[in-house]
């Protein structure tokens, strides 16, 4: 997240961490119910730990943490690495979770987002493109939906329904690391953090979302058949 | 099959240009970033231009810079690298690289170049 | 710039043997490196990519390893078509930079 300011702790309990090997960040996800994450699915990777209810980017042990694997990965099935289009996945968690303060689902929002929309999205990703400066806790940072034909105008052939686009001004955005994260909007999930340009943050180029109200069924038959 | 094959090389005197051209085939060129990686003769690889899918973001070497352009066409499948000032340090084997890694996603992974040219050949001498 | 330290510059090798080529980063990459093949006349072939995983169809006698600056590439039992000069790339940063590359030549 690139200028965005400290979460509140526990603030953001449904966020999560997907790592490789010991502590190695590579995307945000989200809890959405005991069991299950929502990511992006150009987040799938073969083997990596899911960490959940951890404000610090450091490894160092936290009471409200709770760490999983991840024993099944589904991509959406219109998905096609390295494109962006339908860039979401469900993962399966080895155990439930254990409800607390700390570590709680985020109920996904039905409606889409209307423009003008305020909403918050989080991350450990990085804070500039640089690559290697990373936040010491969760970033979060208020974005507001942009509408349709200024998404296209910023992305012109990239854009379709599956995606929103949401900024602020020149400076603010997502950036590496914080693919799969939440942007919640009015108490619910309303997209993941999927693409935007390179480097982030650039003016009339906001971050673009996955726009999680195109796949709700989906998301709740997948669940339900697996 | 996925393919890329370079064209455009030839002998040129120092301060000429050239326009080297990349055609890609067998894979969904308009989604991926691409690369120019050059090779002066008994050298080792030395990274000379990238663009990313949608052309908004490119990024040169010291050595070429405001002398070599890099632009894609997504509808022709096709990769350019429009040469200018050339010197006699630019003599070498040219190749298009496909780049694995999407700089617009917003995961921190990144993989490498997967698919190469053949390579053009250019040589810069009077 | 990053600038990418290959050693050996070359090695010779019998068939079977075990080889270590070693790259290390001016500066922290994290596991952003990958490691390509390159054999005389040919184009560059990636072999291994985020320093440790195998590119598809890459045999299972090369491995990677490493992270931050000290980077390592193994073939656990050199064969004929092993012989080929090894470079590697850090990735996360512009300029890309590549090694100097390692010639794995035949004893």
């Known amino acids: 997240i690139v200028n965005g300011s400290d979460c509140q702790k526990d603030a953001q309990p449904w966020q999560g961490a997907l790592l490789l090997g010991p502590n190695k960040l590579y995307c945000g996800a989200v809890l959405i119910s005991p069991q299950w994450l929502l990511t992006a699915a150009h987040c799938r990777k073969p083997v990596f730990r899911i960490r959940l209810g951890h404000h610090s980017m450091s490894p160092v042990y936290e009471s409200g943490q709770q760490m999983f694997q991840g024993i099944k990965s589904i991509p959406h099935p219109g998905y096609s690495h390295p494109g962006h289009s339908n860039d979401l996945m469900l993962i399966k968690m080895n155990r439930k979770i254990r409800d607390s303060h700390s570590v709680k689902p985020v109920e996904i929002a039905c409606d889409c987002a209307t423009e003008g929309t305020r909403c918050m999205v989080s991350g450990w990703g990085t804070t500039s493109s640089s690559h290697n400066n990373f936040p010491k806790v969760l970033q979060c940072l208020n974005i507001t939906v942009l509408s349709e034909e200024r998404c296209k105008n910023s992305y012109p052939g990239q854009i379709d329904k599956t995606m929103f686009c949401a900024g602020d001004e020149e400076g603010r955005d997502s950036c590496q690391g914080d693919s799969g994260g939440p942007v919640v909007c009015n108490g619910k999930l309303q997209g993941l953090v999927s693409w935007g340009d390179f480097p982030c943050a650039q003016r009339n180029r906001p971050g673009v979302y996955t726009n999680l109200c195109e796949f709700v069924k989906w998301i709740k038959d997948t669940m339900n058949s697996n | 099959e996925v393919q890329l094959v370079e064209s455009g090389g030839g002998l040129v005197q120092p301060g000429g240009s050239l326009r080297l051209s990349c055609a890609a085939s067998?894979?969904?060129?308009?989604?991926?970033?691409m690369n120019w990686v050059r090779q002066a003769p008994g050298k080792g690889l030395e990274w000379v231009s990238y663009i990313s899918s949608s052309s908004s973001t490119i990024y040169y070497a010291d050595s070429v810079k405001g002398r070599f352009t890099i632009s894609r066409d997504n509808a022709k499948n096709s990769l350019y690298l429009q040469m200018n000032s050339l010197r006699a340090e630019d003599t070498a084997v040219y190749y298009c690289a496909r780049d694995l890694t999407s700089m617009q996603s917003r995961d921190y992974y990144y993989y490498g170049m997967d698919v190469w040219g053949q390579g053009t050949t250019v040589t810069v001498s009077s | 710039d990053i600038q990418m330290t290959q050693s050996p510059s070359s090695v010779s090798a019998s068939v079977g043997d075990r080889v270590t080529i070693t790259c290390r980063a001016s500066?922290?990459?994290?596991?952003?490196l990958a490691w390509y093949q390159q054999k005389p006349g040919k184009a560059p072939k990636l072999l291994i990519y985020a320093a440790s995983s195998l590119q598809s169809g890459v045999p299972s006698r090369f491995s990677g390893s490493g992270s931050g600056t000290d980077f390592t590439l193994t073939i656990s039992s050199l064969q004929p078509e092993d012989f080929a000069t090894y470079y590697c790339q850090q990735v996360p940063i512009f300029p890309y930079t590549f090694g100097g590359g390692t010639k794995v030549e035949i004893k």
């Open positions: 067998g894979f969904t060129f308009s989604s991926y970033s």
């Open positions: 500066q922290g990459i994290s596991s952003w």
